[in-house]
Interface confidence: low
């Protein structure tokens, strides 16, 4: 996995190149869960979509998220997460026309309805971590990751490479 300096170097380079008009190289429908196997679920409430982190009962169906993968236009000097030295970015859409957004001002992860081209806040650098886990780093804020805090998603600052493997920013993708 990338050290944090490599992550920041790469992500800063992304600020200079927009990838929002480019078509995804692949798409993948998966359920998203935390390192501790809690499910990430979505529900329409108060006229907006809410994001939950919760234990599902055995018979409850897991929500699926459409992950759209984009290849960066800037080759990386380090390898590990990328394809042929390039890094992958993803957008996450749990339902038509809604995407996960990073709200860096308020340290929150939100669902917003928007049209393509998507804003930078909807893009996350994908890191393949240990044990089939991934993490999602904000395109708009190097070193800030989607994480779990008090049973909900929030943006969490990761200030050293050791903390890249901290459980609260690790997620599992599953086709079931």
């Amino acid at each position: 996995a990338f050290g944090i300096s490599g992550v920041q170097k790469y992500t800063r380079a992304l600020h200079d190149s927009s990838i929002t008009g480019i078509s995804p190289i692949t798409e993948y429908l998966a359920s998203l869960s935390t390192y501790n196997d809690q499910s990430i679920t979505f529900a329409l409430e108060d006229e907006s979509y809410e994001i939950y982190v919760e234990d599902l009962k055995k018979d409850e169906k897991k929500d699926k998220v459409l992950l759209s993968y984009y290849e960066s236009q800037h080759p990386s000097n380090e390898s590990g997460d990328g394809v042929d030295g390039k890094m992958l970015m993803v957008t996450l859409s749990p339902t038509k026309d809604f995407w996960l957004h990073a709200n860096n001002k308020e340290h929150s992860v939100e669902l917003h309805k928007c049209e393509k081209p998507l804003p930078d806040q909807a893009f996350f650098v994908l890191h393949n971590m240990h044990s089939n886990c991934v993490s999602f780093e904000c395109k708009t804020d190097p070193g800030v990751f989607i994480g779990v805090k008090d049973n909900h998603l929030a943006l969490i600052k990761v200030d050293s490479s050791e903390n890249l493997c901290t459980e609260n920013i690790l997620f599992k993708l599953s086709e079931t």
Partner: antibody
Amino acid sequence: EVQLVQSGAEVKKPGASVKVSCKASGFRFKNYWIQWVRQAPGQGLEWMGEIFPGTGTSYYSEKFKGRVTMTTDTSTSTAYMELRSLRSDDTAVYYCARKHRGYGYGGAWIAYWGQGTLVTVSS
Amino acid sequence: DIQLTQSPSSVSASVGDRVTITCSATSSVSSMHWHQQKPGKAPKLLIYRTSNLASGVPSRFSGSGSGTDYTLTISSLQPEDFATYYCSGGYSHPTFGGGTKVEIK
């Protein structure tokens, strides 16, 4: 429909304790921060603390630390606020309230309020 | 902790008047929220995230501002608008302004 229904008015003597309840309905109780705010007669709103039912995590205003305890019962979707060592200046209406979103930190605003519980402290 | 100061603390106005209430924070906040409270009733969310009207709130209410200075405006005061208004902001927990009472002139 989101509703927060609080327990009835209380009259207490100085030095006693009071426990106010707040029964929630219309949303996933364990996923939302519940706030407690009080308002002394003719005064403004004063934040006392908050609790996240999903984990029991709570944060209290420095002013009330050591004197207040906030708890929840997820089986009945009820939040409780206990205030101890009551003084006459604790006479106020106590409100429970719910933030708009179950996720995110700074910026989730109070969207729903209970009807309030008047607590009178008098000898 | 952030402190919020509202001004004026009270204002006398007539039906149809334009009323402006300001809220000043001791340090920058990303957004401000406004609540309306009528005598003997619980507060009610009026405006969230600086300028968004809560469900069912009439369009005569509007909010603006950024950084440390925020404003609530009632473009044409109606009889049901006579109430006390509170701004609310902060990060780790809600902080409230001291309130502005809008009274009948």
